[in-house]
């Protein structure tokens, strides 16, 4: 029989390199049964992890997972940093592993990265 | 003068393909995000599709897979490439100015505060 | 997707009279990404209000915009008779990028 606890899976040591200045969008997969949990998402700044309380997050419902999504509009360098979701059930918390998201700011470089170095370096194209 | 200079546009068979452009003037153009919303004759406004100023493109999910959002900083320019088109898409097609990225923590999102005049694109066989 | 709700479908007013128009999020949105639009016939959407409540360059301050969490109001404290027209509201922190769709403001 399938568990009805609610799971959250985000992957162990799971990252994302993306770019300042585009919007970027960060997804904890969230399972569960009957109702839907209460999920927040914080950063962590050394050993704690500070509540994101005034960003814009989503639902987004999928046939056999929904994704409660982090909204970056737009991505600035200080995003740079780990990050981890929570879920609020049946007054047990559960917390997710932590996901890093790594900012490059293009225009602090001397030069913004053209087209082919773009495709040189997939990395950046995280969507 | 800010501005948004749009063409393009024009009547096209179903299934075919057609390329909007969106020129601006006025501002650093590759330091805003720049979208595409569209409205079908009598009906409300749709959004499309957003670019960021670094890679980053979205889509509405009415369009996924058809429609490629592009730019090019050097020449100020927005594009917006629809293939299979199909009769729901025929409507009048905005672009718009979106968020600032400047650097650092210079940035703001003041929603679309800049409109192109609008270009029509007929999907009829 | 965040959907919005906009009421009335239409409203039917004199000038120098106030209008409040409505908007309701199926979702939280963010009041920092709530924004309103004018667009009148033949003509590009035009934005009043960003951020719920901060006016748009060169926008009377007749339009004002409040509200938080799902619900969000445009006042037009004394219509003129360019204000007739149609209004949407518009969140942008979260995509889809969705519009509300749209109340028609029109002379009683």
């Known amino acids: 029989k399938e568990s009805c606890d609610v799971q959250l899976y985000i992957k162990r040591q799971s990252e994302h390199s993306i770019l300042a200045g585009d919007p970027f969008e960060l997804e904890c997969p969230v399972k569960y049964c009957a109702n839907r949990p209460h999920v927040t998402w914080c950063k962590l700044n050394g050993t704690t992890c500070v509540k994101l309380e005034d960003r814009q997050t989503s639902w987004k419902e999928e046939k056999n997972i929904s994704f409660f999504i982090l909204h970056f509009e737009p991505v600035l360098p200080n995003d740079n940093g780990s990050y981890r979701c929570s879920a609020n059930f049946q007054s047990n918390l559960i917390e997710s592993h932590s996901t890093t998201l790594y900012v490059t700011d293009v225009k602090s470089a001397s030069e913004r990265p053209s087209k082919d170095e773009m495709a040189s370096r997939p990395w950046l194209l995280y969507r | 003068e800010v501005q948004l200079v749009q063409s393009g546009g024009g009547l096209v068979h179903p299934g075919g393909s057609l390329r909007l452009s969106c020129a601006g003037s006025?501002?650093?153009?590759?330091?805003?995000?720049m979208h595409w919303v569209r409205q079908a004759p009598g009906k409300g406004l749709e959004w499309v599709s957003v670019?960021?100023?670094?890679?980053?493109?979205y889509y509405a999910d009415s369009v996924k897979g058809r429609f490629t959002i592009s730019r090019d900083n050097a020449k100020n320019s927005l594009f917006l490439h629809m293939n299979s088109l199909r009769a729901e898409d025929m409507a009048v097609y905005y672009c718009?100015?979106?968020?600032?990225?400047?650097?650092?923590?210079?940035?703001?999102?003041?929603?679309?505060?800049?409109w192109g005049q609008g270009t029509t694109v007929t999907v009829s066989s | 997707e965040i959907v919005l709700t906009q009421s009335p479908g239409t409203l039917s007013l004199s000038p120098g009279e106030r209008a409040t128009l409505s908007c309701r999020a199926s979702q939280s949105v963010s009041s920092s990404y709530l924004a309103w639009y004018q667009q009148k016939p033949g003509q590009a959407p035009r934005l009043l209000i960003y951020?719920?409540?901060s006016r748009a360059t060169g926008i009377p301050d007749r339009f004002s915009g409040s509200g938080s969490g799902t619900d969000f109001t445009l006042t037009i404290s004394r219509l003129e008779p360019e204000d007739f027209a149609v209004y949407y509201c518009q969140q942008y922190g979260s995509s889809p990028y969705t519009f509300g769709q749209g109340t028609k403001l029109e002379i009683k």
């Open positions: 718009a100015r979106g968020f600032y990225y400047g650097s650092g923590t210079n940035y703001y999102n003041r929603g679309m505060d800049v």
């Open positions: 951020g719920a409540s």
């Open positions: 006025g501002f650093t153009f590759s330091s805003y995000a």
């Open positions: 670019i960021g100023t670094g890679v980053a493109t």
